[in-house]
């Protein structure tokens, strides 16, 4: 009965949920998900019994031992796993509390502009990076390259000061969660700036 | 990993004993179930019985009582089988093999075998 | 004893056929039941436990399924390296644990 077990997974992916015990004679293993029972499991008896019929594939226990192995993960499958160990030589059973969150593979990022001037030969505006699902748990960094020192940015919002004449920049969005990272398509400044650079004055979207 | 590894093959005359001996490594010893299991020659598998080395506790099979005692020594992690009384038909390779903690009659690691032959 | 009684004792196939083994118990054992693979002059191994669960790195060629007295081993495509012998056994509660009597699998 330790403290609660964190787990990450990724949709598709599979996880394994740790297990041991040195008990003798286990009586019964139950395994349950956000209270629903999911597996029951009695070792002298020999039989494992998937509540849930649809899991039955996706089930399995790694070199014969207690520990549980979920596989074909779903996004819902996140939630709060229970295991309780039954034996008649223990008081109480012995119980593991564990998280799963269960993560999307980052598709690419998309990259917005925000309002764009162009003053005094600068060329100054935001890059927004952000995911088109909305997917959960997503850390942005920004990596700007070209000039004599590459330079990183935290967050999904990156400013942007670049003077014509400059060597240009190329502008990358990173985006990362617990199981996966994506770039974005590189942006050049010279293009972003291009569309401002007549008008000295000009501010477009 | 996971290694059984059993004595050597043994000749004996009719009425005398062996012990076979099984050392185990690669996993705690004395947490799962160690079986025995015997196959005459050109024959199917036979269950003998099994041990819990962690506290000694065993479980026959009944044609194997008073034929087979199974013991483990947890300091030198290896199982015993001893036969006694044997007769011409105890011809055999007899081997140990461990329980799967999931399914405790499940073996999933075995021995290599020790033959035993009776002979006068 | 729960008497475990397996058909055929033998069978003759091609690399890539279909095979199917099948055992009886003599009693319900649930879902119970282990299938070995086991070559000349070598241990057992272990390839199915509790009916229809494979062991960790058993190809998914081979499946198990069954509950109550009929169980069954399919191998989908047979392979140069399954001619072997296959045990079923079952590890149903209280020992004695029995096994079936055997089916070999021999190259037509």
């Known amino acids: 009965s330790g403290p609660v077990k964190e787990l990450v997974g990724s949709v598709g992916g599979a996880v394994t949920f740790p297990l041991k015990s040195k008990v003798k004679q286990v009586d019964s293993i139950v395994w349950t998900f956000n209270t629903t029972p999911l597996v029951t499991i009695q070792p002298e008896g020999g039989t494992i019994i998937v509540t849930q019929n649809r899991n039955r594939e996706r089930v399995d226990f790694p070199d014969g031992g207690y520990s549980l192995k979920l596989s074909k993960l779903k996004k819902n499958d996140s939630g709060i796993y229970y295991v309780g160990i039954y034996s008649s030589s223990l008081q109480q059973p012995s119980t593991q509390e564990y998280v799963l969150h269960v993560y999307e593979h980052l598709s690419k990022p998309k990259v917005t502009m925000g309002l764009q001037s162009n003053k005094n030969g600068t060329c100054v505006t935001n890059l927004t990076c952000c995911m088109e699902h909305g997917e959960e748990d997503v850390i942005y960094t920004w990596k700007a390259l070209g000039q004599a020192a590459n330079e990183s940015h935290n967050g999904s919002i990156l400013p942007i000061s670049w003077r014509w004449g400059e060597s240009d920049m190329t502008f990358i969005c990173v985006a990362r969660n617990p199981v996966s990272r994506n770039f974005s398509s590189p942006i050049l400044a010279r293009k972003l700036c291009e569309g401002a650079a007549d008008d000295p004055d000009s501010s477009m979207v | 990993q996971v290694q059984l590894v059993q004595s050597g093959a043994e000749v004996k005359k009719p009425g005398a004993s062996v012990k076979v001996s099984c050392k185990a490594s690669g996993y705690t010893f004395s947490s799962s179930w160690m079986n025995w299991v015997r196959q005459a020659p050109g024959q199917g598998l036979e269950w003998i019985g099994r041990?819990?080395?962690?506290?000694?506790?065993?479980k026959y099979n009944g044609k194997f009582k008073g034929k087979a005692t199974l013991t483990a020594d947890k300091s030198t992690s290896t199982a015993y089988m001893e036969l006694s009384s044997l007769r011409s038909e105890d011809t055999a390779v007899y081997y140990c093999a461990r329980s799967t903690m999931i399914a405790t009659g499940a073996m999933d690691y075995w021995g290599q075998g020790t033959l035993v032959t009776v002979s006068s | 004893d729960i008497q475990m009684t397996q058909s055929p004792s033998s069978l003759s196939a091609s690399v890539g056929d279909r095979v199917t083994i099948t055992c009886k118990a003599s009693q319900d054992v649930s879902t119970a039941v282990a299938w070995y693979q086991q070559k000349p002059g070598k241990a057992p191994k272990l390839l199915i436990y509790?009916?229809?669960y494979r062991y960790t790195g058993v190809p998914s060629r081979f499946t198990g399924s069954g509950s109550g007295t009929d169980f069954t081993l399919t191998i989908s495509s047979l392979q140069p390296e399954d001619f072997a012998t296959y045990y079923c056994?079952?590890?149903?509660?209280?020992?004695?644990?029995?096994f079936g009597g055997g089916t070999k699998v021999e190259i037509k």
């Open positions: 509790s009916a229809s």
């Open positions: 056994q079952q590890h149903y509660s209280t020992p004695p644990y029995t």
């Open positions: 041990i819990y080395p962690g506290d000694g506790d065993t």
